[in-house]
Interface confidence: low
């Protein structure tokens, strides 16, 4: 992460792209830097890693060269910002992005003094864009939650930034482990709690089912069973999405009834593919699989309008299939197809034929 | 009101391209399924292709499945069909319609192709 | 692929006549059929969606019934306004198939 002195906009491009910016005065053209004890203004040109930032959980504003986060001190509200440990409860942590604006507790936002010092201040208005940008929003970037897969909290959203081996990560890491997973711990200190989980890795795609994925020999498919998981159905998507898969989708009886062994010992109901998001479009797999095999429960209401649009699967009933709301939190299977370079590594050349 | 404004139509010989366009207003176009639908002088509505709402699930008629992309541009409202390598049956009225059963339809445009 | 079918291909009736009109799918589709009218030189109108539901603004003559493989569209009382071609479309897969369409004019 060492950042040149220059500032590229090839290279502000990258970091952006992690949702990682440089915080400009749209007014002033300055940008806020994090010194020792204070944040100040500086020539935006002089780039270095105290001038990035990134929004992290719980609505902190993280700083990458500083490793810590904005903070509003109650006791002297007026005086200068500064940075504190992410997880403080001395001071105020949480910021709001509103129309260019960054607001915290009780009306303060960021202004700027007349020594070219940030402070928080109920007086004015002062708006903040994204350096190289063309005048970009800053809220553009906002945290999005990312939920664990694995390890042992069920799903939970990864904290960011959270504390290993004395060093603040504001994303996924691999350090510590000999499999080279991407993992992030789920509170912030991860060697006082030990809460963590593996993150979706958009590069697993290229290896494979990794130990978190399991293959069905038959099929070149590889599943993960998201068995302890809560999420909603677009928090499900999302999280096989971003490991290369889709929600889980069942062509046939074969499948199902892999699904169903695999299931055998969980009285548990899951999120599948099958969704009608569309509410004109009919039940449609995510993955864009045509819909020729089905398994309704009985007392599913198949009104195109119906309120639940979204599809489950229930293990432990021969008639599996049920329809739930969206919003609802429930376990989840990702599937993914490997591409035949991958038959060829897992398989040693032999190739099957899909279902 | 809804409304499904289609251009891009026009005559081509056989074995060209050309593409239309259909632009949506009245509704939040990127929670729709929209359809390529045509029809031939005097006969009845064939049903050409679909993309879901965000674009990722497509698909096709035989007749013109390998020879006709749709796309959408939720930003822009807007739905596309690429037509390659156009016969003379391909010579239809062709209507970008919204949703499942679809209450909808663009102003149609007529794709004539001939030599 | 599910194939749509509808009789009869054409009819004449009177004024006032009570009109059936069929379709058949080659495989069972719940009911996710929608009925269509089409006057010459129009667009596609929806009259009826989900086998059985009016679409809003619809008169209430129209009506829809069936559920799987056979359904039947009915106008209880034939008016001279609803001269037109009437066609079947089955959404509940891809390829959303129409049927060859019923042409009703009035005797």
């Known amino acids: 992460e060492g950042v040149a002195a220059a500032l590229t906009p090839e290279r502000l491009l990258e970091w952006q792209d992690k949702g990682i910016f440089v915080i400009q005065s749209e007014s002033l053209k300055k940008c806020i830097q994090a010194g020792k004890s204070v944040l100040t203004l500086e020539n935006c040109k002089q780039a270095n890693k105290h001038m990035l930032w990134k929004w992290v959980s719980n609505h902190g504003l993280f700083n990458i060269g500083g490793s810590g986060c904005l903070g509003l001190n109650f006791s002297a509200p007026e005086q200068p910002l500064s940075l504190y440990e992410c997880d403080s409860t001395l001071v105020s942590l949480r910021w709001r992005c509103n129309r260019k604006m960054i607001t915290g507790p009780l009306q303060y936002s960021v202004q700027v003094a007349h020594d070219n010092t940030v402070v928080a201040s109920r007086k004015y208005i002062h708006k903040w864009i994204s350096y190289g940008s063309g005048g970009g929003d800053i809220c553009e970037y906002l945290h999005k939650d990312l939920h664990t897969i694995k390890g042992n909290t069920h799903g939970m959203p990864c904290m960011f930034p959270f504390q290993y081996n004395h060093q603040w990560h504001h994303e996924c890491t691999r350090e510590g482990r000999e499999d080279d997973l991407l993992w992030c711990a789920t509170t912030s200190r991860y060697e006082r709690d030990e809460k963590w989980g593996f993150c979706p890795d958009p590069t697993s795609a290229e290896v494979g089912c990794d130990t978190i994925w399991e293959k069905d020999l038959n099929s070149h498919i590889c599943y993960q069973f998201n068995l302890l998981s809560s999420l909603s159905w677009s928090e499900a998507h999302s999280s096989c999405q971003m490991q290369g898969g889709t929600l889980l989708s069942i062509t046939d009886e074969t499948e199902e009834n892999f699904i169903r062994e695999h299931m055998s010992s969980k009285t548990v109901e899951v999120w599948m593919g099958l969704n009608q998001l569309d509410e004109h479009a009919g039940w449609q797999w995510s993955d864009g699989t045509p819909l020729n095999y089905l398994n309704w429960s009985p007392e599913v209401n198949f009104e195109p309008f119906v309120e639940d649009h979204c599809g489950t699967f229930s293990s432990f009933m021969p008639s599996a299939w049920r329809s739930r709301d969206c919003e609802s939190t429930l376990p989840y299977i990702c599937k993914k197809y490997l591409n035949h370079i991958d038959h060829e590594i897992v398989e040693g050349g032999h190739h099957h034929h899909h279902h | 009101q809804v409304q499904l404004v289609q251009s891009g139509g026009g005559v081509v010989q056989p074995g060209n391209s050309l593409r239309l366009s259909c632009v949506a207003s009245?509704?939040?176009?990127?929670?729709?399924?929209i359809h390529w639908v045509r029809q031939a002088p005097g006969k009845g509505l064939e049903w050409v292709a679909v993309i879901s709402y965000d674009g990722s699930n497509k698909y096709y008629a035989d007749s013109v499945k390998g020879r006709f992309t749709i796309s959408r541009d939720n930003s822009k409202n807007t739905l596309y069909l690429q037509m390659n390598s156009l016969r003379a049956e391909d010579t239809a009225v062709y209507y970008c319609?919204?949703?499942?059963?679809?209450?909808?339809w663009g102003q149609g445009t007529l794709v004539t192709v001939s030599s | 692929d599910i194939q749509m079918t509808q009789s009869p291909s054409s009819l004449s009736a009177s004024v006032g006549d009570r009109v059936t009109i069929t379709c058949r799918a080659s495989q069972g589709i719940r009911n996710y059929l929608a009925w269509y009218q089409q006057k010459p030189g129009k667009v596609p109108r929806l009259l009826i969606f989900?086998?059985?539901t009016l679409q809003s603004g619809v008169p209430s003559r129209f009506s829809g019934s069936g559920s799987g493989t056979d359904f039947t569209l009915t106008i209880s009382s034939l008016q001279p306004e609803d001269v037109a071609t009437y066609y079947c479309?089955?959404?509940?897969?891809?390829?959303?198939?129409f049927g060859p369409g019923t042409k009703v004019d009035i005797k």
């Open positions: 009245g509704f939040t176009f990127s929670r729709y399924t």
């Open positions: 989900a086998a059985s």
């Open positions: 319609a919204r949703g499942g059963p679809t209450p909808d």
């Open positions: 479309q089955k959404y509940y897969s891809a390829p959303f198939t």
